[in-house]
């Protein structure tokens, strides 16, 4: 990114001139590459610093930047410098560093394990429902239904590879065509981005940290949603993904490869398999309309089985239905045929916690969901704390500069593409985009990585997960090879197309702007983050699913007016910001709408009232609870008895949310509100955790 023009020798006036921002301030550019600014949220947002009158820059340039919350904070090193330590101190410091590194790796390990168990928990709670989504016959004709099924199933099983493998098995069994599978794959791409958004919610305690973390996580969501918004209609109209991948599959004579390397699983599996082991085939069987599978448990009980093949005699309606013409007869009453059956003999039980409990899947899933979220949250808090203590001063400066600095001119544009490759490579190593992006989220939160840098890393992660799928496809058996490879390639080219749409030209990097906008809103109204998650990953897909089941007419009847209103609002918003004069005075802002339609403040009041019942009792136990409370009710009163929150409440007094200029928002009133132009709610009702 080009540096913001500054006057080299202009000295700031020691007596700072402060002037209220009269109008809309321009969006301050990201200055993180040059300066490490402290995220001083206490500074009044709407005030700007004036340069002395002798500075010519003031005559040419627009006023200097607003204190930009997106600037990376300086992680101050409060400790004694290395050179000032004695030998004992140096040794102690060295071992402390080693200890921190071990702790960091340990928490990182359990963080990844908890993500794996979280996925298992979701599969236990919603896996069978997910399988039933797939058995809907309308998928074939309705790409929109395919898309939302992809989203819902991936959200329910918390793994795009699981939903993709179900699709592959359905395609190779001719239950689904590649054409019908493509929207599902697109949906799976969206669904997989929920994991790091959930991880971002864990950083709700610190507003500025949460702003960055949530924006960093949702940049993935917006990239996927926008890509689908453009590429699904293109695919429906042209079938370009289907055609390109078909040509590739047909032009190469692939031989079955070896299994995709399980790099991270090798380390995590020994632990996670002691917690729970799942029989993933059950979901696939349900998807393929296997009635018997509906009553099977997903929890794996037997790990060692002996399979014996035998022939049994089965009745058939007529001899035309015989499995083998030569092995067919009648006893005069019934028609019989011989069927090869595989008889499974159980030998040894699995070694995991739930093997002897015989609990229903829902119960096991709920237990694991709660526990894995607690572990995930705990690990995340500890990772952030350790990173915060490690990444101070010089170390932070070096890391930040390494990660966030561009190549020298004229190769600056290559930096992002290298980041894409790094993201792809790292995802390939950890074998999961969820794990990689979830690990990235706290780093964005604490300010080690900028969103601008996290964006290409995330895009690379999307590519990395598809290369894993391609390798897995090459390792699949002969009958599934073609379909699994074609689907994996569809996934790959979909992500490539998305990158071409939303990355090469800086102007088109909409996901960054949208994510920052959402980050700003969510930092001010933290309940909105949960609201966003529910709306985008559950309600919208479920609504589309329901309307699709009702038929095309209903879907179009409801969808067209909704889409029309959205387009109308967007056009109006564009005109308001670009050329308001062409609009009648009434339409130049949103004030003609009632407050609840243009501001989140009335909604905030509703949410506060709704969560009021929890406020006095919801979290008097621990820091983790305190975070959960703050996320829900945005109020410190509920944490009165928790020391952690009392301290924070004092520190938070009088703070407001610093926000960039309103261009980042869809709603100008929301933006002004977040900037502090609209009077904020009583600061006593704001609470930050840790």
């Amino acid at each position: 990114m080009a540096p913001w023009p500054e006057l080299g020798d202009a000295q700031p006036n020691p007596d700072k001139y402060l002037e209220g921002a009269a109008g809309q301030q321009p969006t301050a550019p990201d200055k993180s590459k040059e300066t490490n600014k402290t995220d001083n949220t206490e500074a009044p947002v709407t005030k700007i610093e004036l340069l002395p009158s002798y500075s010519t820059a003031t005559l040419i340039d627009e006023p200097t930047e607003v204190d930009d919350p997106w600037n990376l904070p300086t992680l101050q090193d409060s400790g004694i410098k290395w050179s000032e330590r004695d030998t004992k101190g140096k040794i102690l410091c060295f071992f402390q560093g080693i200890g921190r590194l071990i702790l960091l790796l340990g928490f990182l390990y359990f963080f990844v394990c908890s993500l794996d168990i979280l996925s298992s928990a979701f599969q236990l709670v919603g896996g069978k429902m997910a399988g039933q989504f797939f058995s809907n016959s309308s998928i074939m004709s309705n790409p929109l239904l395919g898309l939302v099924i992809g989203v819902l199933v991936t959200v329910l099983v918390q793994s795009s590879s699981t939903s993709t493998s179900i699709v592959v098995s359905m395609v190779s069994s001719s239950l689904l065509t590649v054409r019908a599978a493509i929207p599902i794959i697109m949906g799976a791409n969206i669904g997989t981005s929920i994991t790091n958004t959930i991880v971002a919610l864990m950083q709700v305690g610190d507003r500025s940290e949460f702003r960055r973390a949530f924006a960093g996580a949702t940049v993935h969501d917006f990239f996927n949603w926008l890509s689908v918004l453009v590429l699904l209609p293109v695919e429906v109209a042209t079938h370009y993904l289907e055609i390109i991948t078909q040509l590739i599959v047909e032009s190469f004579h692939f031989k079955n490869g070896e299994d995709a390397p399980d790099l991270l699983k090798v380390i995590t599996k020994p632990f996670t398999k002691l917690i729970v082991q799942l029989d993933k085939k059950v979901i696939s069987q349900i998807a393929m309309n296997d009635e018997k599978a509906k009553n099977k448990s997903l929890v794996k009980i037997w790990c060692k089985t002996f399979t014996n093949k035998t022939q049994i005699n089965v009745t058939v309606p007529s001899t035309a239905n015989c499995t083998s013409p030569s092995l067919c007869w009648t006893d005069g009453i019934q028609n019989w045929t011989m069927k090869n059956v595989t008889y499974k003999e159980n030998i040894a039980k699995c070694q995991h916690i739930f093997v002897n409990f015989h609990l229903p899947d829902l119960a096991v899933g709920t237990i694991l969901l709660i526990l894995s979220l607690l572990v995930l949250c705990g690990c995340l808090i500890m990772i952030v704390k350790i990173l915060g203590s490690v990444l101070k001063g010089q170390v932070a400066t070096v890391i930040k500069k390494t990660i966030n600095t561009d190549f020298p001119f004229p190769f600056a544009w290559l930096t992002g593409y290298l980041a894409i490759l790094v993201g792809a490579g790292m995802t390939f190593i950890v074998q999961s985009s969820s794990v990689f992006t979830s690990a990235l989220t706290p780093l964005i939160g604490i300010g080690v990585i900028t969103i601008e840098r996290a964006y290409p890393l995330t895009l690379g992660s999307n590519i990395g997960t598809t290369t894993t799928a391609i390798l897995a496809a090459l390792a699949s058996p002969g009958n599934a090879l073609r379909s699994s490879l074609q689907i994996a390639l569809c996934h790959f080219f979909f992500n490539i197309s998305g990158i071409l749409l939303w990355y090469p030209i800086p102007f088109t990097r909409l996901p960054i702007r949208m994510a920052k906008g959402l980050g700003n809103i969510s930092a001010k109204y933290r309940w909105f983050a949960v609201f966003y998650l529910i709306i985008f990953f559950f309600l919208i897909p479920l609504t589309v699913f329901g309307l699709s089941l009702a038929g095309w007419r209903v879907l179009v009847g409801v969808g067209v007016p909704v889409v029309f209103i959205i387009i109308l609002v967007l056009c109006l918003r564009l005109l308001q910001s670009r050329c308001p004069r062409v609009l009648p005075k009434k339409l130049q802002n949103w004030n003609f709408l009632p407050l609840w339609m243009r501001s989140l403040k009335p909604w905030d009041a509703v949410v506060s009232k709704f969560t009021g019942c929890f406020q006095m009792r919801c979290c008097c136990c621990c820091r983790v609870c305190c975070r959960a409370c703050c996320l829900l009710c945005d109020c410190p009163k509920c944490c009165r008895c928790s020391k952690c929150c009392e301290d924070l409440e004092e520190a938070q007094e009088g703070q407001d949310v610093p926000v960039k200029a309103p261009e980042t928002f869809d709603n100008i009133t929301i933006s002004r509100e977040a900037q502090g132009e609209v009077p904020a709610s009583d600061s006593k009702t704001e609470c930050t955790a840790l």
């Epitope: 005699n313 009745t315 001899t319 013409p325 030569s326 092995l327 067919c328 007869w329 009648t330 006893d331 005069g332 009453i333 019934q334 028609n335 019989w336």
Partner: antibody
Framework: EVQLQQSGPELVKPGTSVKISCKTS????????IHWVKQSHGRSLEWIGG????????NYKQNFRGKAALTADKSSNTAYMELRSLTSEDSAVYYC?????????????WGQGTSVTVSS | DIVVTQSHKFMSTSLGDRVSITCTAS??????VAWYQQKPGHSPKLLIY???TRHTGVPERFTGSGSGTDFTLTITNVQSEDLADYFC?????????FGVGTKLELK
């Protein structure tokens, strides 16, 4: 020892009915199908029908539907065949035979036969 | 209905000889064919089922072969107790049908 003991010979008038029994022993009656076969003129064999005693499911050859009625009594391990509206054409030796249910071993054991003579 | 044809109503043989009795089905019956032996004044007795499987207690000199539409019962080293009527039966589809029988007699 597997045995299918049929009732004795019958001399009946045309238009009447006759009920032949086939008492079994030495095997699990409900695991088998009991078939009835007609042999006329001392030569050709013709399948009449069969019954699964376990669930009383029956099947008949088309030209014996309405002519023969097959029943089974699980308590006495006995199968019955009733022949209705008898004519001289029905004069023959009637055999009962067992067939292992769900197996392709055919009629592996037969009764000694019951001679039915229709004469006025 | 599947028609089962035994072309030879009578077959003459000498003791110790090898004899083959044939049977043809009007359509493909796979291997769902059984052979029965009936001595005068007795009830039929199962010899072969599934075209070639010998029933328990049946001497090894009786062998069955064939599949589809053509089947053969072969008796090697004919004994006097083998002189009887031989019926083939198809059980591929209902109704079960029998051949008219082949009478084996001494020359």
């Amino acid at each position: 020892e597997v045995q299918l003991q049929q009732s004795g010979p019958e001399l009946v008038k045309p238009g009447t009915s006759v009920k032949i029994s086939c008492k079994t022993s030495g095997f699990f009656f409900t695991e088998y199908i009991i078939h009835w076969v007609k042999q006329s003129h001392g030569r050709s064999l013709e399948w009449i029908g069969g019954i699964i005693p376990n669930n009383d499911v029956t099947n008949y050859k088309q030209n014996f539907r309405g002519k023969a009625a097959l029943t089974a009594d699980k308590s006495s391990n006995t199968a019955y065949m009733e022949l209705r509206s008898l004519t001289s054409e029905d004069s023959a030796v009637y055999y009962c035979a067992r067939w292992r249910n769900a197996y392709y071993s055919a009629m592996d054991s037969w009764g000694q036969g019951t001679s039915v003579t229709v004469s006025s | 209905d599947i028609v089962v044809t035994q072309s030879h109503k009578f077959m003459s043989t000498s003791l110790g000889d090898r004899v083959s009795i044939t049977c043809t089905a009007s359509q493909d019956v796979g291997t769902a064919v059984a052979w029965y032996q009936q001595k005068p004044g007795h009830s039929p007795k199962l010899l072969i089922y599934w075209a070639s499987t010998r029933h328990t207690g049946v001497p090894e000199r009786f062998t069955g072969s064939g599949s589809g539409t053509d089947f053969t019962l072969t008796i090697t080293n004919v004994q006097s107790e083998d002189l009887a009527d031989y019926f083939c039966q198809q059980y591929r589809t209902s109704p079960l049908t029998f051949g008219v029988g082949t009478k084996l007699e001494l020359k």
